[in-house]
Interface confidence: low
């Protein structure tokens, strides 16, 4: 009976890093000649193991191929990576001169590699968004096999529906990549919020991988700015307060102007933090009434996170308007930049 090359396993599934055993037996000792293992068929096939010559550090034979009556040509390939996936053929050669001649091939064993996805990476917009703005986040994970994978988005524990999720390549490959995009509507309470991308795969058991984006890195909450007058501490003094409330991030510059001229430059040090993650800042400005006979427009100018300045004016009437020489009247103008005289 003519020699047959038997590869009993149609397919083998191995986890990355483990050892794959590819089984092969021959039904006869005749004809005499070596066995070679190849990945793939045809002229482009790759030599994996050659019984006759060469050294194959990752390949070991299951049985002793030097024994005369050996008909087991199974091999083990160590430290499997996704790049090892493919169909492996056990091929019997007949001794020839000058070269051995291919005699018979096994049916092939498909080696599939289980590889874990990389930890998901979540990226967001380059510029900060503002409340009510829609911003996109992208989650990417790569290097997994097989292709089946589940990706979910969450914001503060609530599942979000992605705009688009793609697994590439679409055809058969040694490993795969996933990319998903979700749209989030920002709100002013999002400074403490997180967007989470969760990837589940057969290689991860019941422990999905998570990628996290802190919305604090992607949101800008502009301050509300108010100028108020405190009760006078003495006959010839007025206390003005400029309050910037509920802003994020903390980058803030505050300038006091008198009639349009810079009077004081604040670089806030002691910000107070609100429970929602935003900040408040209060700046006090002492006005000396004896120095002002005419009306003076005091301006609080707030620059937040390199955005255009927010301006609030407050007019203080000078001595010329006052029947009582010891007092000063003030007119706030918190909503406009023009003077109220």
């Amino acid at each position: 009976e003519e020699l047959q090359v038997i590869q009993p396993d149609k397919s083998v599934l191995v986890a990355a890093g483990e050892t794959a055993t590819l089984r092969c037996t021959a039904t006869s000792l005749i004809p005499v000649g070596p066995i070679q293992w190849f990945r793939g068929a045809g002229p482009g096939r790759e030599l994996i193991y050659n019984q006759k010559e060469g050294h194959f550090p990752r390949v070991t034979t299951v049985s002793d191929l030097t024994k005369r009556n050996n008909m087991d040509f199974s091999i083990r390939i160590g430290n499997i990576t996704p790049a090892d996936a493919g169909t492996y053929y056990c091929v019997k050669f007949r001794k020839g001169s000058p070269d051995d001649v291919e005699f018979k091939s096994g049916a092939g064993t498909e080696l599939s590699v289980r590889a874990k996805p990389s930890p998901p990476e979540v990226s967001g917009p380059a510029d900060r968004g503002i409340p009510d703005q829609k911003v996109n986040f992208t989650c990417k994970s790569h290097g997994f096999s097989p292709r089946n994978i589940t990706l979910k988005w969450f914001k503060d524990g609530q599942e979000l529906h992605p705009l688009e999720t793609t697994v590439n390549p679409s055809g058969k490959n040694v490993s795969y990549n996933i990319s998903s995009t979700v749209r989030v509507v920002l709100n002013s309470m999002d400074v403490n919020s997180k967007v989470i991308c969760e990837v589940a795969h057969i290689t991860l058991d019941r422990s999905p991988l998570r990628g996290i984006a802190n919305l604090s890195n992607f949101i800008r909450v502009s301050p509300t700015v108010k100028v108020t007058q405190q009760s006078p501490t003495s006959m010839n003094q007025v206390n003005l307060t400029c309050r910037a409330e509920r802003f994020y991030p903390e980058d803030l510059q505050l300038i006091w102007l008198e009639n349009g001229n810079v009077s004081r430059n604040d670089t806030p040090k002691n910000l107070t933090k609100n429970t929602d993650g935003t900040y408040n800042y209060t700046s006090l400005f002492l006005v000396n009434s004896s120095a002002h006979r005419e009306d003076v427009v005091f301006t609080c100018q707030v620059k937040h996170d390199q955005q255009p300045a927010i301006t609030r004016n407050h007019t203080v009437l000078g001595f010329a308007h006052s029947s009582d020489q010891g007092s000063m009247q003030t007119f706030p103008d918190n909503n406009a930049t023009h003077n109220w005289n």
């Epitope: 790759e46 030599l47 994996i48 010559e53 194959f56 550090p57 430290n79």
Partner: antibody
Framework: QIQLVQSGPELRKPGETVKISCKAS????????MNWVKQAPGKVLKWMGF????????TYADDFKGRFAFSLETSASTAYLQINNLKNEDTATYFC????????????????WGQGTSLTVSS | DIVMTQSQKFMSTSIGDRVSVTCKAS??????LAWYQQKPGQSPKALIF???YRYIGVPDRFTGSGSGTDFTLTITNVQSEDLAEYFC?????????FGAGTKLELK
Amino acid sequence: QIQLVQSGPELRKPGETVKISCKASGYSFTNYAMNWVKQAPGKVLKWMGFINTYTGEPTYADDFKGRFAFSLETSASTAYLQINNLKNEDTATYFCTRTRGYYDFDGGAFDYWGQGTSLTVSS
Amino acid sequence: DIVMTQSQKFMSTSIGDRVSVTCKASQNVGTHLAWYQQKPGQSPKALIFSASYRYIGVPDRFTGSGSGTDFTLTITNVQSEDLAEYFCQQYNTYPLTFGAGTKLELK
């Protein structure tokens, strides 16, 4: 028996080009990747990269990207190393050496070596 | 890059002695390690692959051992033809890298 035979010693001036050959015999040339290794006087052996003898695709180590080129003449079972715009620091002995299949980079133990080609770059 | 350290540049021995050449990898290379012997004016000769497997024709007085980061080439019953330089090389990760070599000389 398996042999890798390299071309003879070379003396070149800076800025010139040199092409070193490595002829393989005794085995199936396209079954094994061909690597190049540099041994400068008093320095550690340095792997330059390899060429896939089946597809002709070269892979270069970072330090050897740019002026260095691997090529093949498959019909003659010969691999070549060309170095352009020679510099004094290219003075060294260059070895060709084979590794088993190239289906994965793990197969990087060099079982057979050429005798080496001495290159001297001097003005 | 993975750095292969052969801490001893020279080792003195006598004929018939047993000597151990060590090699340390800067990170785990599994058993993807080879040993080579080089004599002056010659090309390196392959001795060991996969940390402990001898190439065909290499005398059994040469033994390789180790895995991970620490490797040893042991020569028992040193012969005069063993006086040479010995290099280790990792092939776990690109770029493939060599140790600086250990020269075996007579006491």
